[in-house]
C-alpha cells in the first residue's frame, strides 16, 4: 500500500499531542488513531444509482499508517466492481463512481502500522428514489449486557422515504409459551413513534430487573413495505462475594 | 459518440407552462445516468432543476418542486421538461445534461423567455 | 439546503497561478466537480472527483477538496482561460444537486 501522509488532510486538526522532535531523535511511535471520527459518524450511506460514493477514514500516526480497504470482510480490488474505484491516501478516502446495486455491502477501511491498527465500517445501500421500504442501520440494536439495577440504551438507525413508523417490541412469554396460536411471536409494544414519543430511533429501559433480560426488536415500517431488527438484553447479577453479607452467623434449615 | 439537444418554444406567455424536450443520439438513454435540466437567467449563474433516471426516478430542486415535472420517453430515447405557471424570472437558457455525480455532457441550449 | 460559496471574480496576469475557492459545510466529505463556461456556450467539465480531469483538460488544471473548503487552481494561465467557473457537488444528504455562485476569471493585460 501507498503511504498517505500523516496529516489531517480534511481538518485543521491541531490536537495532536506529540511533541516536536530534534533532528536526531527518533519520533515517538504512535499506533493509529482517528483524527476526525466526528467526520465519520454516518455509518448507513444510502445512495441512488450512478452517483459517487465517497467514504473517509481521517487518521494519522507514527510511523505514517497504511490504508486498505475491505468490502463485506474480504479484500476489495478495483476489478471487484466495474469502473474500480480510487483510493485518495492523502485524504484517507475510497470513491466509487457510478455506483450500482452489486455495490452495496459493508466497506470497511484498516489503518495501521507496525504499532497498532484501528478499522471502521460504513454500510451502503443503493436505492431507487421512488418510494422504498425503509433501510436499517446494521449492527443496530447491539446485544447488550448489563448489571441489574443499570440503564440501557438500544438505538435503531433508520433510513425511509416516506416517513416511517418506528416500534420497538419485546419478545414475550404468555402462559409459558413465546408462541401464540396464530404461530406468531408474542410481543409487547414498548414504544412507537407518535406524538408523545421523542427520537423513535432510541430505546431507554431504566433500572433494568432480569425479568427485562430478552429479545427487543426494532420494527419499521411505511407504506411500502417493513423492516426490523433484533438485540439481546443480558441482566447479570452482581457476583457472588460483591453481595453486602446480611447475615452475621451461619444460619441452618432443617 | 452521444449528442443532447433541446427543443421547444422559445417563447412562454406568463402563466403558461414551459415545455422542452431532449433528444439523446448516440446511445442510449437507459444507460447508468441521470438526465438533467439546468438553467441560467441571463447574466446570472447555474441553477440546478431537477433530473430523472431511466426507471422514472426523479429528483426536483425544492425551490421549483411545485412547479416542475420531468419525465422520461424510452421509446423516443429522449427526457422533457415541464414548469408550470412561469413568471419573467423563468426566462433563461434551459439545458439539458447527462449526469452521474457530474455532467460530462450537455445540450447546447437553448433560450426561453416569458413575455407576453 | 447545501450552500457553496464562490468569490465573484478572480483576476491573475498571464503565466501566473490562479485559485478558485468553492466554500461549504464539511465539503471535504463530498465529491466537487468543476466547470468552465465561456460566453454564449455551455459549461464544460474541467475537473470531477475532487481532482480528476476528463480527457482532453490541460493538466494545468487541477483541483483539491479538504474540510470546508474546494480548490480548483489553473497554473501558467492563458488568455484562454478566461471565463466563469463553477463548482458543483451533488449534496448526498439532501439528495439534490447544487452550484456556487459562479467566479468570473480575468485574465489582466
Known amino acids: 500500500d501507498a503511504l498517505p501522509s500523516s496529516e489531517d488532510d480534511d481538518d485543521d486538526d491541531d490536537s495532536s499531542s506529540e511533541e516536536k522532535e530534534t533532528d536526531n531523535t527518533k519520533p515517538n511511535p504512535v499506533a493509529p488513531y482517528w483524527t476526525s471520527p466526528e467526520k465519520m459518524e454516518k455509518k448507513l450511506h444510502a445512495v441512488p444509482a450512478a452517483k459517487t460514493v465517497k467514504f473517509k477514514c481521517p487518521s494519522s500516526g507514527t510511523p505514517n499508517p497504511t490504508l486498505r480497504w475491505l468490502k463485506n470482510g474480504k479484500e476489495f480490488k478495483p476489478d471487484h466492481r466495474i469502473g474500480g474505484y480510487k483510493v485518495r491516501y492523502a485524504t484517507w478516502s475510497i470513491i466509487m463512481d457510478s455506483v450500482v446495486p452489486s455495490d452495496k455491502g459493508n466497506y470497511t477501511c484498516i489503518v495501521e502500522n507496525e504499532y497498532g491498527s484501528i478499522n471502521h465500517t460504513y454500510q451502503l445501500d443503493v436505492v431507487e428514489r421512488s418510494p422504498h421500504r425503509p433501510i436499517l442501520q446494521a449492527g443496530l440494536p447491539a446485544n447488550k449486557t448489563v448489571a441489574l439495577g443499570s440503564n440501557v440504551e438500544f438505538m435503531c438507525k433508520v433510513y425511509s422515504d416516506p416517513q416511517p413508523h418506528i416500534q420497538w417490541l419485546k419478545h414475550i412469554e404468555v402462559n409459558g409459551s413465546k408462541i401464540g396460536p396464530d404461530n406468531l411471536p408474542y410481543v409487547q409494544i414498548l414504544k412507537h413513534s407518535g406524538i408523545n414519543s421523542s427520537d423513535a430511533e432510541v430505546l431507554t429501559l431504566f433500572n433494568v430487573t432480569e425479568a427485562q433480560s430478552g429479545e427487543y426488536v426494532c420494527k419499521v415500517s411505511n407504506y411500502i413495505g417493513e423492516a426490523n431488527q433484533s438485540a439481546w438484553l443480558t441482566v447479570t447479577r452482581p457476583a457472588l462475594e460483591e453481595r453486602p453479607a446480611v447475615m452475621t452467623s451461619p444460619l441452618y434449615l432443617e | 459518440q452521444v449528442q443532447l439537444q433541446e427543443s421547444g418554444p422559445g417563447l412562454v406567455k406568463p402563466s403558461g407552462t414551459l415545455s422542452l424536450t431532449c433528444a439523446v443520439s448516440g446511445g442510449s438513454i437507459s444507460s447508468n445516468n441521470w438526465w438533467s435540466w439546468v438553467r441560467q437567467p441571463p447574466g446570472k449563474g447555474l441553477e440546478w432543476i431537477g433530473e430523472i433516471y431511466h426507471s422514472g426516478s426523479t429528483s426536483y430542486n425544492p425551490s421549483l418542486k411545485s412547479r416542475v415535472t420531468i419525465s422520461v420517453d424510452k421509446s423516443k430515447n429522449q427526457f422533457s421538461l415541464k414548469l408550470s405557471s412561469v413568471t419573467a424570472a423563468d426566462t433563461a437558457v434551459y439545458y439539458c445534461?447527462?449526469?452521474?455525480?457530474?455532467?460530462?455532457?450537455w445540450g447546447q441550449g437553448t433560450l426561453v423567455t416569458v413575455s407576453s | 439546503s447545501y450552500v457553496l460559496t464562490q468569490p465573484p471574480s478572480v483576476s491573475v496576469a498571464p503565466g501566473q497561478t490562479a485559485r478558485i475557492t468553492c466554500g461549504g459545510n464539511n465539503i471535504g466529505s463530498e465529491s466537487v466537480h468543476w466547470y468552465q463556461q465561456k460566453p454564449g456556450q455551455a459549461p464544460v467539465l474541467v475537473v470531477y472527483d475532487d481532482s480528476d480531469r476528463p480527457s482532453g483538460i490541460p493538466e494545468r488544471f487541477s483541483g483539491s477538496n479538504s474540510g470546508n473548503t474546494a480548490t480548483l487552481t489553473i497554473s501558467r494561465v492563458e488568455a484562454g482561460d478566461e471565463a466563469d467557473y463553477y463548482c458543483?457537488?451533488?449534496?448526498?444528504?439532501?439528495?439534490?444537486?447544487?452550484f456556487g455562485g459562479g467566479t468570473k476569471l480575468t485574465v489582466l493585460g
Open positions: 458543483q457537488v451533488w449534496d448526498s444528504t439532501s439528495d439534490h444537486r447544487v
Open positions: 445534461a447527462r449526469g452521474t455525480d457530474w455532467y460530462d455532457l
